[in-house]
Amino acid sequence: RPSFSLVEDTTLEPEEPPTKYQISQPEVYVAAPGESLEVRCLLKDAAVISWTKDGVHLGPNNRTVLIGEYLQIKGATPRDSGLYACTASRTVDSETWYFMVNVTDAISSGDDEDDTDGAEDFVSENSNNKRAPYWTNTEKMEKRLHAVPAANTVKFRCPAGGNPMPTMRWLKNGKEFKQEHRIGGYKVRNQHWSLIMESVVPSDKGNYTCVVENEYGSINHTYHLDVVERSPHRPILQAGLPANASTVVGGDVEFVCKVYSDAQPHIQWIKHVEKNGSKYGPDGLPYLKVLKHSGINSSNAEVLALFNVTEADAGEYICKVSNYIGQANQSAWLTVLPKQQAPGREKEITASPDYLE
């Protein structure tokens, strides 16, 4: 059987908020140069399967064999590394499965620096020690598929070394990527080995390849960018926030409301209050007091901090968020305990993450 090893990332990522878009990371097939590699297209009911490498159609040749749902690469070389995809065309739809092939005999994925001393951060390679380009930090390159909301910034990086120091250039869909190819151009930070595109638009979709080369060799790495157009929706509040809280008289407490909204949201913190001993007005509606709202004079509107609380502060606190499409609200209760009934817990000062997009 052809030899290969399958490396799967089993890290569980937190659930993405609604204004983020994520394509699951492809499986990585690793092979040493000279080995053979076999990959099965993991799509069901595939009537017709087509294959691509780095966005370019892949056909059979003397080293590449395509049989049914299998791709075989005989005598793999580093040039076979890249982002592969198999597309199953059906009568009513099509589906694509992405995977990565990494053909290498030595990859350094450690941190680029030890930083053991505070002076020089790195030592230049001995001028006599000639070396073809190599990747210095493959961790920064693992995420090949980038699905990004329109208007966001995108950064692709290819940290590399070599002697003499290699140069870096970028291709889009296999062709030289020029500044005039996108409105606003792009930025290249050579010291970071990165390509940066601000405010991406749908026409930025495609494959971006860094080519790193010196007189002793050339290496390349391809990223796929998908730009997702935002769809407006009413605000969405993270479940479980704000959270119920308890504190003693004289204590401090903080409520956090985490908001996801493409459209500009307006946040209000509201509390039910009593007026003349009644919680409801003559019209049957509850008496409400706006404690805080987003605006020019309000920082961190998504956090409501209460200091030196009294028993009168106990009750329900409502986080109400609205945008031009609609509104949402969630509430939490504050329990105020007498000083002798302090809740027994480890003393900890924390700030929950807060966000207003």
């Epitope: 620096e113 505070g118 790195f122 990004v148 290249v188």
Partner: antibody, heavy 119, light 107 residues
Framework: QVQLLESGGGLVQPGGSLRLSCAAS????????MSWVRQAPGKGLEWVST????????EYADSVKGRFTISRDNSKNTLYLQMNSLRAEDTAVYYC????????????WGQGTLVTVSS | DIQMTQSPSSLSASVGDRVTITCRAS??????LNWYQQKPGKAPKLLIY???NLQSGVPSRFSGSGSGTDFTLTISSLQPEDFATYYC?????????FGQGTKVEIK
């Protein structure tokens, strides 16, 4: 050891100009990107501008674009910030900072120089 | 520009407390985030780079975590010299931005 020493600050009228300098020592200056960061009295930090070691990459904050110019002289191990058309809101302590290799963490900072724009 | 929102803006704590400060980015910034400490009249000092790496010479009670949009700076056991203002800083974009700062005061 790494040292960064700013100079050139002072009092200037609105619309005036000032040139800040940052003398660097203790490291190979041309190997590092350098930045200017400012802090208005009682306020937070605000990034102003960055220049890479070979001067081929330069970037400015929107608030200073077209008015400030960053430059460097690697033979003199010195970073500069030419500030023109100064405004009251440019009043701040200006720090020069070295960027960590392969990253943009400011690992060394100068002591800062105060620029006051007032009539 | 990428906005960085720090919380809380200030907090009161005692020596020995565990303190957590959070920073949220308006978009995914990978791990391109640093944390600084600044004391009155002094220049900022780098504590954590690339979200979780401790800068040389910084005490191990400081730690950083997070990636994407949510980041945390934790001081495991607050010491007298830790009372200061802390800033997060993103460098994912070419236009760097800082959080508004969190002032850690003595309770």
């Amino acid at each position: 050891q790494v040292q960064l020493l700013e100079s050139g600050g002072g009092l200037v009228q609105p619309g005036g100009s000032l040139r800040l300098s940052c003398a660097a020592s203790g490291f190979t200056f041309s190997d590092y990107a350098m930045s200017w960061v400012r802090q208005a009295p009682g306020k937070g930090l605000e990034w102003v501008s960055t220049i890479e070691g070979d001067s081929n990459y330069i970037e400015y904050a929107d608030s200073v674009k077209g008015r400030f110019t960053i430059s460097r002289d690697n033979s003199k191990n010195t970073l500069y910030l030419q500030m023109n058309s100064l405004r009251a809101e440019d009043t701040a302590v200006y720090y020069c900072a070295r960027e960590r290799t392969y990253s943009s963490a400011f690992d060394y900072w100068g002591q800062g120089t105060l620029v006051t724009v007032s009539s | 520009d990428i906005q960085m929102t720090q919380s809380p803006s200030s907090l009161s704590a005692s020596v020995g407390d565990r303190v957590t400060i959070t920073c949220r980015a308006s978009q995914d910034i990978s791990s391109d985030l640093n944390w600084y400490q600044q004391k009155p009249g002094k220049a900022p000092k780098l504590l954590i780079y690339d979200a979780s790496n401790l800068q040389s010479g910084v005490p191990s009670r400081f730690s950083g975590s997070g990636s994407g949009t949510d980041f945390t700076l934790t001081i495991s056991s607050l010491q007298p010299e830790d009372f200061a203002t802390y800033y997060c800083h993103q460098w994912y974009s070419t236009l760097y931005t800082f959080g508004q700062g969190t002032k850690v005061e003595i309770k």
